[in-house]
């Protein structure tokens, strides 16, 4: 054997080296790779050093017996049956509340004759639940509502008002509360005729009534 070269590098089971016929002189770099379903154990890159020894020990190719980490999914949590995802392991994704799952909830790591083990499906997605809108409420008699839409998105507010001479009984603004189904925060108000009795009573005034014959107050009723 020549004494100015590094030793010959052998082939390794379930893998190959490149270049396949390397010059064994100082500075030569050899890369080992594994066949599908196997992974390199040790250093895959060896270099012929000044002292004519290889920089690393010979690597080996080991059967891949686990799946890669399928990753986290936004707006979800995951339950893992085995931390290193070996063949047979499961990962269950559960969407956070208010989100819906698109795809498979449970992934299983399956072995393959050729190649590395693979997940039964791709990771799912968790999408924001579409909240149903509230149906439009009719305007109160002798009143109006704004906006005058038939459907109001969750979170929207509608406002009520009354015609002159009428007062609002109930909430002037009500909200479409998000939910399943979405619902109005309060019943729609009503518009009631403004009465003078009500007007005076609300101010706690004592009003002396005039005789019936000339009662402008009674006439106003």
């Amino acid at each position: 054997p020549r004494n100015d070269t590094c030793p010959e590098l052998p082939e390794i089971p379930n893998g190959w080296k490149s270049p396949s016929q390397p010059e064994l002189v100082h500075g030569t770099v050899v890369t080992y790779q594994c066949y599908p379903g196997y992974q390199v154990v040790g250093s895959s890159v060896l270099m012929c050093q000044w002292d004519l020894t290889w920089s690393e020990d010979l690597p080996s190719c080991q059967r891949v017996t686990s799946c890669h980490d399928p990753g986290d999914v936004e707006h979800s949590r995951r339950l893992i049956s085995s931390p290193k995802f070996p063949v047979g392991a499961t990962v269950q994704y559960i969407c956070d509340q208010g989100f819906v799952l698109m795809g498979s909830s449970i992934l299983t790591c399956h072995d393959r004759q050729a190649g590395s083990p693979k997940w039964s499906d791709r990771a799912p997605k968790c999408l924001l639940e579409q909240l149903k809108p509230c149906h439009g409420l009719s305007a109160p008699e002798n009143g109006a509502r704004s906006p005058e839409k038939q459907l109001h998105p969750a979170g929207a507010t509608i406002h009520f008002s009354c015609a002159p001479g009428y007062v609002l009984k109930g909430q002037a603004s009500i909200k479409c509360v998000p939910g399943h189904p979405s619902h109005w925060s309060d019943p729609p108000p009503i518009c009631r005729a403004a009465s003078l009795d009500g007007f005076y009573n609300s101010r706690s005034l004592d009003v002396a009534k005039a005789p019936a014959a000339s009662s402008t107050l009674d006439a106003a009723h």
């Epitope: 707006h75 949590r77 995951r78 339950l79 893992i80 049956s81 990962v91 956070d96 509340q97």
Partner: antibody
């Protein structure tokens, strides 16, 4: 009637490990995930993690990874929680609680853990 | 993680009085759940999915809210309602709890 029966109080030394149990009855054990919740002396509640008794799948609150280990024994309908490298910070009441669809519908009576030298 | 802040931390009410306690979330959430805990006992699910009463909970209790603001209301306070109430969310993992509102009877 759903019942979650937890193991008795524990007095442990710092650095030790403890294993507490939660035996479920009154429902099909594998139909519901089991959660563990910590309540410290200040009375606040913290979610530790959960286990799916059917698949054995486990999920942890990042804060308790490395501290708690959750397991189940389907044959006895029992959930377990191991706590390691105990410190005084781990002194608390620990509850198991059944999954109630984003909340916790049934709770065990709690296991009191005291860590003291 | 989402932080839930309950207020007030402690309150007292007379029998028959209307009581409202609130739970504020650091980010918008879809639903809120509430638990009742009496001294020396485990928490009980009280209100779930914002407004649904758990089995056996009296009709004087109600829950409401959306976004970042939620509340639990008792229409007529009774002595047996004296307890600590915790809110909880799972619109974002990990689920989190509020610090509790301790309700005392006057």
């Amino acid at each position: 009637e759903v019942q979650l029966q937890q193991s008795g109080p524990e007095l442990m030394k710092p650095g030790a490990s403890v294993k507490m149990s939660c035996k479920a009855s009154g429902y099909i054990f594998t139909d519901y995930n089991m959660h563990w919740v910590k309540q410290n002396q200040g009375k606040s509640l913290e979610w530790i993690g959960e286990v799916n008794p059917n698949t054995g799948g486990i999920g942890y609150n990042q804060k308790f990874k490395g501290k708690a280990t959750l397991t189940v024994d389907k044959s006895s309908s029992t959930a377990y929680m191991d706590l390691r490298s105990l410190t005084s910070e781990d002194s608390a009441v620990y509850y198991c609680a059944r999954d109630g669809n984003y909340c916790f519908d049934y709770w065990g009576q709690g296991t009191t853990l005291t860590v003291s030298s | 993680q989402i932080v839930l802040t309950q207020s007030p931390a402690i309150m007292s009410a007379s029998p028959g009085e209307k009581v409202t306690m609130t739970c504020s979330a650091s980010s918008s959430i879809s639903y809120m759940h509430w638990y009742q805990q009496k001294s020396g006992t485990s928490p009980k699910r009280w209100i779930y999915d914002t407004s649904k009463l758990a089995s056996g909970v009296p009709a004087r209790f109600s829950g409401s809210g959306s976004g970042t603001s939620y509340s639990l209301t008792i229409s007529n306070m009774e002595a047996e309602d004296a307890a600590t109430y915790y809110c909880q969310q799972w619109s974002s993992t990990p689920p989190t709890f509020g610090g509790g509102t301790k309700l005392e009877i006057k």
